[in-house]
């Protein structure tokens, strides 16, 4: 029952999604909000935190297949840790291999999400739109 | 409290969204599903109907501002009525002025939705991906 259903099946049940902050998008019990006010990565992160959320974490192509459809570039919660060279999410977990195609657009320690599971490396101080996420599962 | 919040406010309440068919997107109590199997307009319409839904109806830029972010082109439930020259939705309602920018890409009586509230006229028999919608409010 993916977002991109190859075969159409009549759903057996209808269900509620959430809970999410009012007027956020709910998909597979995760909450998403897109903000079109451009902020640097740190201010974007702070904005999400102020709403008990975090910047977008990509953890599953299946559970987050709605992200295939997102146009433009938006800050996500991925940061480069210079001490060990790894890319890490805000929750401290390491980026799983094969989840994102990382593209070095600029020198930087932060990453923009772009459609079809691409991550563009960017300078953290550059203003961009951003995606906040709240996991409820 | 739009999808594109200009000012960040801590939500006073969290709430559930829906009900929707399992694994559909829920936003402002409407349900959306994107299908990447290409079908002509009539088959797309039938697919949505088989799931107690209809092809996408654009009725409010505010309530449907998530559609700003959608990349690519997808069938929506807008058809041209040659007898009176109007564009109407599956439910019989007429397209409200200023909701969509209609662009004549091809000669046709059906329309594709494209990001930022654009509608591209297309031949109804051409296969395309499509968006189903279920209104719960």
């Amino acid at each position: 029952n993916s977002l991109f259903n190859q075969e159409v099946q009549i759903p057996l049940t209808e269900s509620y999604c959430g809970p999410c902050p009012k007027n956020w998008i709910c998909y597979k019990n995760n909450c998403y909000q897109f903000f079109n006010e451009s902020k640097n990565w740190y201010e974007s992160q702070a904005s999400c935190m102020s709403q008990n959320a975090s910047l977008l974490k990509v953890y599953s192509k299946e559970d987050q297949d709605l992200l295939k459809l997102v146009k433009s570039y938006h800050w996500m919660g991925l940061v480069h840790i210079p001490t060990n060279g790894s890319w890490q999410w805000e929750d401290g977990s390491i980026l799983s291999p094969n989840l994102l195609t990382i593209i070095e657009m600029q020198k930087g320690d932060c990453a923009l999400y772009a459609s079809s599971f691409k991550g563009y490396i960017e300078n953290c101080s550059i203003p961009n739109t951003y995606i906040c996420m709240q996991r409820t599962v | 409290n739009s999808l594109f919040n200009q000012e960040v406010q801590i939500p006073l309440t969290e709430s559930y969204c829906g009900p929707c068919p399992k694994n559909w997107i829920c936003y402002k109590n409407n349900c959306y599903q994107f299908f990447n199997e290409s079908k002509n307009w009539y088959e797309s319409q039938a697919s949505c109907m088989s799931q107690n839904a209809s092809l996408l109806k654009v009725y409010s830029k505010e309530d449907q501002d998530l559609l700003k972010l959608v990349k690519s082109y997808h069938w929506m439930g807008l058809v041209h009525i040659p007898t009176n020259g109007s564009w109407q939705w599956e439910d019989g309602s007429i397209l409200s002025p200023n909701l969509l920018t209609i662009i004549e890409m091809q000669k046709g009586d059906c329309a594709l939705y494209a990001s930022s509230f654009k509608g591209y006229i297309e031949n109804c028999s051409i296969p395309n991906t499509y968006i189903c919608m279920q209104r719960t409010v």
Epitope: E43, A46, M49, N52, Q88, G92, S93 | V8
Partner: antibody, heavy 121, light 107 residues
Framework: EQSGGGAGGGLVKPGGSLELCCKA?????????MSWVRQSPGKGLEWIGR?????????AYASWVNGRFTLSRDIDQSTGCLQLNSLTAADTAMYYC?????????????WGQGTLVTVSS | DIQMTQSPSSVSASVGDRVTITCRAS??????LVWYQQKPGKAPELLMY???TLQSGVPSRFSGSGSGTDFTLTISSLQPEDFATYYC?????????FGQGTKVEIK
Amino acid sequence: EQSGGGAGGGLVKPGGSLELCCKASGFDFSIYWMSWVRQSPGKGLEWIGRIYGGSSDYTAYASWVNGRFTLSRDIDQSTGCLQLNSLTAADTAMYYCVRLNPSFSRSFDYWGQGTLVTVSS
Amino acid sequence: DIQMTQSPSSVSASVGDRVTITCRASQGIFSWLVWYQQKPGKAPELLMYGASTLQSGVPSRFSGSGSGTDFTLTISSLQPEDFATYYCQQGYSTPYTFGQGTKVEIK
């Protein structure tokens, strides 16, 4: 590194007020949050609240604070303060200013040395 | 508020012993879990974040695991400097909350 554990601690009477301040150094104050955590004698750790070091005014408090405590910050001075009002004996504790690192699971990765606040008549 | 419950509240062990401390959250917190070490008269120090990522400079004898509601801190071979009190903390949502602490004492 964070220097200073909070100036202004000491003995205060019940119902009294006190302001604790903490100056951060050695890192960019504007990209972190300052939090305050307290520890009563022989007890565990209790989170009080957090304030963003950047230009946006984001704060959050523990529900038990109930408006008695207020966080503030001076970005130019890289300083954060905690105003304590309507103090009771139950507020007697060591008060720590801490750096909240939002990229490391919202952990408190640097701690001031702490300021002991004693509420007693 | 999310409650964090640690067990045991204290443990007596000898140098070289393997020590395990558990922390349970009252609701799922994914991997937003942090561990601290506190020695008497000192401020706590960050040990681990993300449930299993060691803070820079922390010895590899410390390890962490878990996700969701159940988490574990393990010291594989206890050293004299490891005798301290250990706290877990959730960073998933405000108010941030700590476990009540586990004191590791010399047997």
